[in-house]
Amino acid sequence: YDFTNCDFQKIEADYLRTISKDLITYMSGTKSTDFNNTVSCSNRPHCLTEIQSLTFNPTPRCASLAKEMFARKTKATLALWCPGYSETQINATQAMKKRRKRKVTTNKCLEQVSQLLGLWRRFIRTLLKKQ
């Protein structure tokens, strides 16, 4: 999916109002220095591409993020403010239901969410630069 035509201001507002709080809640008990940020992004569409990948694509050591509240809100935000995004999710949603896994917060998942926080912050910064 090409995130170029998204309403970035609306996405930023949703992130600051609610998604960020859920990400921070998920990370509670860990320090920001616990993990190194290894994933970066260069512009707003690229940031959203990386955010989508890290939030919804299961990895061998962290398969459960898509069911988290911040992930559900991220999906809702992208479906609302990115033209045509929702239709790309119809088959993906059905596949995810079949893949349902036990919810476990592993250290690897905490590291992934730490990366997500970094990507979202980068997204906000690239937005501020453009204004």
């Epitope: 507002a13 949703d14 109002r17 609610t18 559900r72 809100k73 999906k75 809702a76 935000t77 479906a79 609302l80 403010w81 033209p83 045509g84 929702s86 239709e87 999710q89 119809i90 949603t93």
Partner: antibody, heavy 120, light 107 residues
Framework: QVQLVQSGPEVKKPGSSVKVSCKAS????????MHWVRQRPGQGLEWMGT????????DYNQNFKGRATITADKSTSTAYMELSSLRSEDTAVYYC?????????????WGQGTLVTVSS | EIVLTQSPGTLSLSPGERATLSCRAS??????VHWYQQKPGEAPRLLIY???QSISGIPDRFSGSGSGTDFTLTISRLESEDFAVYYC?????????FGTGTKVEIK
């Protein structure tokens, strides 16, 4: 089963406001946005706006911006649509309709409609 | 704002005939089109979503096709209960919009 039950018909004077409610049951309220659509007598469907409980945000059709306010009470699974500065052209049936925000993404259930008559 | 134009405005057919309804978008919207049926005094009812996806409980005589700017709703053999107004709707981008409607009436 999924049900959206709207408040009863209203007769209003020009310049006044009306608040229509839509009580949802049979599903998880926060998994769906609530949209409002109106239909003037003998006319087509017109999207007014939406409230997304999951994100606590709303969006409006520019034609209604400033006059329409869409809210929701998550504790009672009830959505509201308030329209102010009413004029005769606002005489219409107002529908609420749910739409999935993390799946389905389509208005798959509708309220029965609320007739609002604006007359002096 | 994406404008949806439906044609024809009215379709006069007999029971058993095939109905073909058209919906044209003012810009490409991939497959983000849904079809609704509305009978007098009733709320709209979803028939087809995302251009061609069928809904459980909807008779299989209803089918949808198309992508980009041109979409079609087909009713293979009209039954008496199918005479109604049909609307297409786009959810490609906000504000969501509806088509002008096609009335299918008995000839």
């Amino acid at each position: 089963q999924v049900q959206l039950v709207q408040s009863g018909p209203e007769v209003k004077k020009p310049g006044s406001s009306v608040k229509v409610s839509c009580k949802a049951s049979g599903y998880i309220f926060t998994d769906y946005a609530m949209h409002w659509v109106r239909q003037r007598p003998g006319q087509g469907l017109e999207w007014m706006g939406t409230f997304i409980p999951l994100l606590d945000t709303s969006d409006y059709n520019q034609n209604f911006k400033g006059r329409a306010t869409i809210t929701a009470d998550k504790s009672t699974s009830t959505a509201y649509m308030e329209l102010s500065s009413l004029r005769s052209e606002d005489t219409a049936v107002y529908y609420c309709a749910r739409m999935g925000v993390t799946h389905s993404y389509v208005m798959d259930a509708w309220g029965q409609g609320t007739l609002v008559t604006v007359s002096s | 704002e994406i404008v949806l134009t439906q044609s024809p405005g009215t379709l006069s057919l007999s029971p058993g005939e095939r109905a073909t309804l058209s919906c044209r978008a003012s810009q490409p919207i991939s497959i983000s089109v849904h079809w609704y049926q509305q009978k007098p005094g009733e709320a709209p009812r979803l028939l087809i979503y995302f251009a061609s996806q069928s809904i459980s409980g909807i008779p299989d005589r209803f089918s949808g096709s198309g992508s980009g700017t041109d979409f079609t709703l087909t009713i293979s053999r009209l039954e008496s209960e199918d005479f109604a107004v049909y609307y297409c709707q786009q959810t490609f981008s906000l504000p969501y919009t509806f088509g002008t409607g096609t009335k299918v009436e008995i000839k």
